[in-house]
Interface confidence: low
C-alpha cells in the first residue's frame, strides 16, 4: 500500500480539532491580478504582501497595487497601501528587503513618463512606515544592498549610471557613467564594467573592469577586454576576450582584482558561455560549455586558489546562457551535488556527488519503486530527479528539489526511476540520508515544504481543480494525515513558509472565484498543537553522515573528516523550535588519495585513485602563468581537495617556484593598472 | 505472464454508452500506468486514455474529453473505460495497454466496439 | 500538439533486405519514442522504446537510432515473419502522446 495508507502508521491524535483552531483565513479585497510576498527579517513574522492589478484600457494600461502587512507570520493582514500613498509599485522590482535582521524596505513606485525621476518608498521599520523619497534618475535594477551595511545601496539608471546612496536611499550620487554591471564585493567594495564606445552589447568583449573601495571617492581599473565578470566565494572571476581571436578565458582573482590569474579552464567561442555553478571560500564549480548548440557543457572543480582544475563532469546539461541547469546544492548534507547529464542518445539522467564533484554516481532506485519503461533492466536502474530543465520544458513538475540545513539529511523531489528521466507524471521522491537511498512518499507531483527544521513536511496536491485539501507528515514522509482546511475549494497558487524552516506556520495563496470576481485568499495554518511538546534528549538519535559501510574505520569520511549528528527520531512527534540548532560532531580523518585531486599537468583515469602525467605533458617542465609571473612546478601529481580536513595518512610533495619571469597572458599586470580620484 | 484481457465490447447505437473492462495478472498491478489505445477498421493506431498508477491523474486527447472516462480499481487489478455519447466514428477495436512510462510495453488482445443503427 | 510524420506508408521488400523506417516529430522530443509491430488481426508489439533500446524478446535485426526530431527504425535483414505494421509513438512532453500514421511492410 501507499505510505501512509497501513495500519502500521500512528496517527496523530485529534489533529483535526487541533488545526481547526489553528488555520486563519484573510480574504484580501482585491480583484485578481498578480501577488508577491516577501518576508521581513528572520523570526520577526513580519510578512509584505503586494498585489497588482492591470486595467487595460484602450490607450493605456491602468494598475493598481495595494500593500499588506501581516506581524503574526501570515495569521492577520493589515492593509498598509495609505502608508504609500496609494501609489502603483513596479513588481518587476520586487520588494526590495535587506540584509539579515535590518528591517529596511525599498518599494519602485511607478511614475508618469514626463518625470525626472523615479520614486521608491523606504522603511527601516519592518514596514511599520515608509517615507517616500524622489529619484534624481530612472531605476533600471532594484536596489541592491551592501552585505556589510544595509545604509549603503546602488543601483543601476535607466541611462546606464551608477548611482550609489550612503543613507539608505534619501540622497543619491551617480559615481560612473557607462555601466553595464555592478556587484556587491566584500567590504563595500563595487566591481562593475564599463563601455567606451556606445552600448554595453557594442562593446561586449571590449569592456573595462573598475572596483571602488570607497563608495565612488576613487577607482581603479583592474581589467580590460572584458566580456562579464562574476563573484563566487571569495574568488572574483573575469572572463577576457583573448588577443588574436574572438575566443575567451577565465581569469580569477582572490586579491579583490588587484592581481590575476588565468584559470586552467578551456577557451570559449562566441556561442559559448562560462557558468559559476556554485562557490564557497575553499572552490568553486565551473560550467564550461561546449563548442556548438549541443545543450551540454563540462563542470570542473577548483582548486583552493580557483586556477587549477579537476575535470569533474561531461556532458552537464546546460541549455544555452542563462537557460537550464539542474545543477543543485544539497544543503543538507554536505559535499553533496545533484545534476543532469545528457547521455549520447539524448536522454536526460540524474547524477549525485557525495564528495564535492570528485566522483559522480546514479542515484539508488528506490526498494519501493519500480524501473519503468526507460530501463534496459527491469530490475536495475535509478531514481532521475526533477528540477528546472523539467520545469522549464512544461513537464508536470510544479517544485525543483528542496534541502534545508538545519533539516539534516533530507531530500524532497519530483522524480521517475529508470534509465532516463521520463515524461510520464512524476512521483514525490524523499531521502534522509542526503541522497544515499530514496523512497516514494507521495504519488504524483506535489508543493511541499519543510517546517520546524525538518520535524513537519507538509505537501499539497499539484491539480488544475480546485483544492481543499493539505497533507502532513511527522515522521519525515514515511505516514500522512490530510486536513480539509476550507469548506470551499480554491484555485491554489502558492505554499509559503518563512525561510530557514524553522517556522511551524505554513500559509495556503490562492483565490476564489465566483461568477462575478476572483479574489486572493490566503490560509494560514500553525502546527504548533500538532507538536505539542518540546523535544527532549531522548527524541534525538546519533546518525553518521556519509556513512556506507560500518564496519570500515573510515567510514563517513567526506573531505577528510566525518560527522555525526543528533537527529530526531522519526517516531517521535514534538517541538524542534525556532532556536533549534543542528548539533554535530566533527572527527579528523587520516590522509588517502581520495583526498587528494590532480595537480596541474595530471589526471585520474576511470575508477582510479592515482592520478597520472597527462601524455601531452610528460617530459615538460611544468610552468603556468601566476599572478602575473611565470611558475614552475615540481609535483607528483596530487594537491588537497579544497576543505578537506584529513592528517597523517598519504602525504604527496609539491613545490611552486617562482621562476621571475613576466607573463600577462593578455590581461592587464598589476604594475599597468591605472588608478583615478573623483 | 503479463496477461491483459479485455471485455465489455459489442454493438451499441449512436448515442449509446459502454463500458469496457481490463483484467491484468501477472505483474504488481497498482505500480503501473495504464493506458487504452483503439484502431478503427483498416487504420492505425490512436490514443485514447491514460491512468496514472494510483488512480490520481488521467489524460484524454481534447477530441474525446468529456465522453470517455478511464479509472481503475488495484484492488481488483482492473482498468476501465467508461464510454458515453457514442458515434459511428468511435467503432474501433479498443486495446488496453500496460504504461509504465516512455512505452506501452504489454497490450491485451483487443475488445472491438461497434456503434451503428 | 505534437506532430508524427513516418514514412514510407508503404514499402514492399524481400527477404534478406535492409529496410529503414523513418518517423519525423514537429519538435525535439529528446529520445522519448518507441516503436511497435503490428500484425494483421494482432494486437501491437513493443519493438523499441526509448528511441534505441531493444524491447525484451526482441531478435538482434532490429534497432532503433536517431536523437531530437528525426528517429529512424531498421531492420537489417528481413525475416518472412516481419512482414507487418510499424507504428512510431512518442512520449514529450504532456499528452496527447500520438502515434505516426503507420508503415505497411510488404513481400515484394
Known amino acids: 500500500s501507499a505510505p501512509g495508507e497501513d495500519e502500521e502508521c500512528g496517527r496523530v491524535r485529534d489533529f483535526v480539532a487541533k488545526l481547526a483552531n489553528n488555520t486563519h483565513q484573510h480574504v484580501f479585497d482585491d480583484l485578481r491580478g498578480s501577488v508577491s510576498l516577501s518576508w521581513v527579517g528572520d523570526s520577526t513574522g513580519v510578512i509584505l504582501v503586494l498585489t497588482t492589478f492591470h486595467v487595460p484600457l484602450v490607450i493605456m494600461t491602468f494598475g493598481q497595487s495595494k500593500l499588506y502587512r501581516s506581524e503574526d507570520y501570515g495569521k492577520n493582514f493589515k492593509d498598509i497601501t495609505d502608508l504609500i500613498n496609494n501609489t502603483f509599485i513596479r513588481t518587476e522590482f520586487g520588494m526590495a528587503i535587506g540584509p539579515e535582521n535590518s528591517g529596511k524596505v525599498v518599494l519602485t513606485a511607478e511614475v508618469s513618463g514626463g518625470s525626472r525621476g523615479g520614486r521608491i518608498f523606504r522603511s527601516s521599520d519592518f514596514a511599520k512606515n515608509f517615507v517616500q523619497t524622489d529619484l534624481p534618475f530612472h531605476p533600471l535594477t532594484q536596489m541592491m544592498y551592501s552585505p556589510q551595511n544595509s545604509d549603503y545601496l546602488l543601483a543601476l539608471s535607466t541611462e546606464n549610471g551608477l548611482w550609489v546612496s550612503k543613507n539608505f536611499g534619501g540622497k543619491w550620487e551617480e559615481i560612473h557613467k557607462a555601466v553595464c554591471l555592478a556587484k556587491w564585493g566584500s567590504d563595500n567594495t563595487i566591481f562593475f564594467t564599463t563601455y567606451a564606445n556606445g552600448s554595453c552589447k557594442a562593446d561586449l568583449g571590449a569592456l573595462e573592469l573598475w572596483r571602488t573601495s570607497d563608495l565612488g571617492k576613487s577607482f581603479k581599473t583592474i581589467g580590460v577586454k572584458i566580456y562579464s565578470f562574476g563573484l563566487g566565494g571569495r574568488f572574483l572571476f573575469a572572463s577576457v576576450m583573448a588577443d588574436k581571436d574572438t575566443t575567451r578565458r577565465i581569469h580569477v582573482s582572490t586579491d579583490q582584482g588587484d592581481t590575476w590569474s588565468m584559470a586552467q579552464l578551456p577557451s570559449v567561442g562566441q556561442e559559448q558561455f562560462y557558468s559559476i555553478l556554485a562557490a564557497n571560500d575553499d572552490m568553486v564549480f565551473m560550467h564550461v560549455d561546449e563548442p556548438g548548440d549541443t545543450g551540454f557543457g563540462t563542470i570542473f572543480t577548483s582548486d583552493d586558489r580557483g586556477i587549477v582544475y579537476s575535470k569533474s563532469l561531461d556532458r552537464h546539461l546546460y541549455t544555452t546562457t542563462g537557460g537550464e541547469t539542474d545543477f543543485t546544492n544539497v544543503t543538507s548534507l554536505r559535499g553533496v551535488y545533484i545534476t543532469s547529464v545528457l547521455s549520447e542518445d539524448n536522454s536526460i539522467q540524474t547524477m549525485i556527488t557525495f564528495d564535492q564533484g570528485g566522483r559522480w554516481t546514479h542515484l539508488r532506485k528506490p526498494e519501493n519503486s519500480e524501473c519503468d519503461a526507460t530501463a534496459k533492466n527491469k530490475n536495475e536502474c535509478s531514481l532521475h530527479i526533477h528540477a528546472s530543465y523539467s520545469i522549464s520544458q512544461k513537464l508536470n513538475v510544479p517544485m525543483a528539489p528542496l534541502s534545508e540545513p538545519n533539516a539534516v539529511g533530507i531530500v524532497i523531489a519530483h522524480g521517475s526511476v529508470g534509465d532516463a528521466i521520463s515524461v510520464m507524471v512524476p512521483d514525490v521522491y524523499i531521502s534522509d540520508d542526503g541522497g544515499y537511498s530514496w523512497t516514494k512518499m507521495l504519488e504524483g507531483p506535489h508543493y511541499y515544504t519543510i517546517l520546524d527544521s525538518g520535524g513537519i513536511i507538509v505537501a499539497i496536491e499539484h491539480s488544475s481543480r480546485p483544492i481543499n485539501v493539505i497533507k502532513f507528515s511527522t515522521d519525515e514522509g514515511q505516514c500522512w494525515q490530510t486536513y480539509t482546511f476550507t469548506r470551499d475549494p480554491i484555485y491554489f497558487t502558492g505554499l509559503a513558509s518563512e525561510p530557514g524552516a524553522r517556522s511551524m506556520n505554513i500559509s495556503i495563496w490562492g483565490f476564489t472565484e465566483s461568477f462575478l470576481t476572483s479574489q486572493w485568499v490566503s490560509y494560514t495554518i500553525d502546527f504548533k498543537d500538532i507538536l505539542e511538546r518540546n523535544c527532549e534528549e531522548k527524541d534525538y538519535t546519533i546518525w553518521l553522515a556519509h556513512s556506507t559501510d560500518p564496519e570500515d574505520y573510515e567510514d563517513g569520511c567526506i573531505l577528510g573528516y566525518k560527522e555525526q549528528f543528533l537527529r530526531l527520531r522519526k517516531s517521535s512527534v514534538c517541538q524542534n523550535g525556532r532556536d533549534y540548532v543542528v548539533t554535530k560532531q566533527p572527527s579528523i580523518c587520516l590522509c588517502s588519495l581520495e583526498d587528494f585531486l590532480c595537480d596541474f599537468g595530471y589526471y585520474r583515469p576511470e575508477n582510479d585513485s592515482k592520478c597520472v602525467e597527462q601524455p601531452e605533458l610528460k617530459g615538460h617542465d611544468l610552468e603556468f602563468c601566476l599572478y602575473g609571473r611565470e611558475e614552475h612546478l615540481t609535483t607528483n601529481g596530487y594537491r588537497k581537495i579544497p576543505g578537506d580536513k584529513c592528517q597523517g595518512g598519504v602525504n604527496p610533495v609539491r613545490e611552486v617556484k617562482d621562476l621571475k619571469k613576466k607573463c600577462t597572458s593578455n590581461f592587464l599586470s598589476p604594475e599597468k593598472q591605472n588608478s583615478k580620484s573623483n | 505472464e503479463v496477461q491483459l484481457v479485455e471485455s465489455g465490447g459489442g454493438l451499441v447505437q449512436p448515442g449509446g454508452s459502454l463500458r469496457l473492462s481490463c483484467a491484468a495478472s501477472g505483474f504488481t498491478f497498482n505500480i503501473y500506468g495504464m493506458s487504452w489505445v483503439r484502431q478503427a477498421p483498416g487504420k492505425g493506431l490512436e490514443w485514447v486514455a491514460t491512468i496514472s498508477s494510483g488512480g490520481i491523474y488521467t489524460y484524454y486527447p481534447d477530441i474525446l474529453k468529456g465522453r470517455f472516462t478511464i479509472s481503475r480499481d488495484n484492488a481488483k487489478n482492473s482498468l476501465y473505460l467508461q464510454m458515453n455519447s457514442l458515434r459511428a466514428e468511435d467503432t474501433a477495436v479498443y486495446y488496453c495497454a500496460r504504461h509504465p512510462g516512455g512505452a506501452m510495453d504489454y497490450w491485451g488482445q483487443g475488445t472491438l466496439v461497434t456503434v451503428s443503427s | 500538439d505534437i506532430q508524427m510524420t513516418q514514412s514510407p506508408s508503404s514499402l514492399s521488400a524481400s527477404v534478406g533486405d535492409r529496410v529503414t523506417i523513418t518517423c519525423r516529430v514537429s519538435e525535439n522530443i529528446y529520445s522519448n519514442l518507441a516503436w511497435y509491430q503490428q500484425k494483421p488481426g494482432k494486437s501491437p508489439k513493443l519493438l523499441v522504446y526509448?528511441?534505441?533500446n531493444l524491447a525484451d524478446g526482441v531478435p538482434s535485426r532490429f534497432s532503433g537510432s536517431g536523437s531530437g526530431t528525426d528517429y529512424t527504425l531498421t531492420i537489417s535483414s528481413l525475416q518472412p515473419e516481419d512482414f507487418a505494421t510499424y507504428y512510431c509513438?512518442?512520449?514529450?512532453?504532456?499528452?496527447?502522446?500520438?502515434f505516426g500514421q503507420g508503415t505497411k511492410l510488404e513481400i515484394k
Open positions: 509513438q512518442h512520449f514529450w512532453g504532456t499528452p496527447p502522446w500520438t
Open positions: 526509448a528511441a534505441t
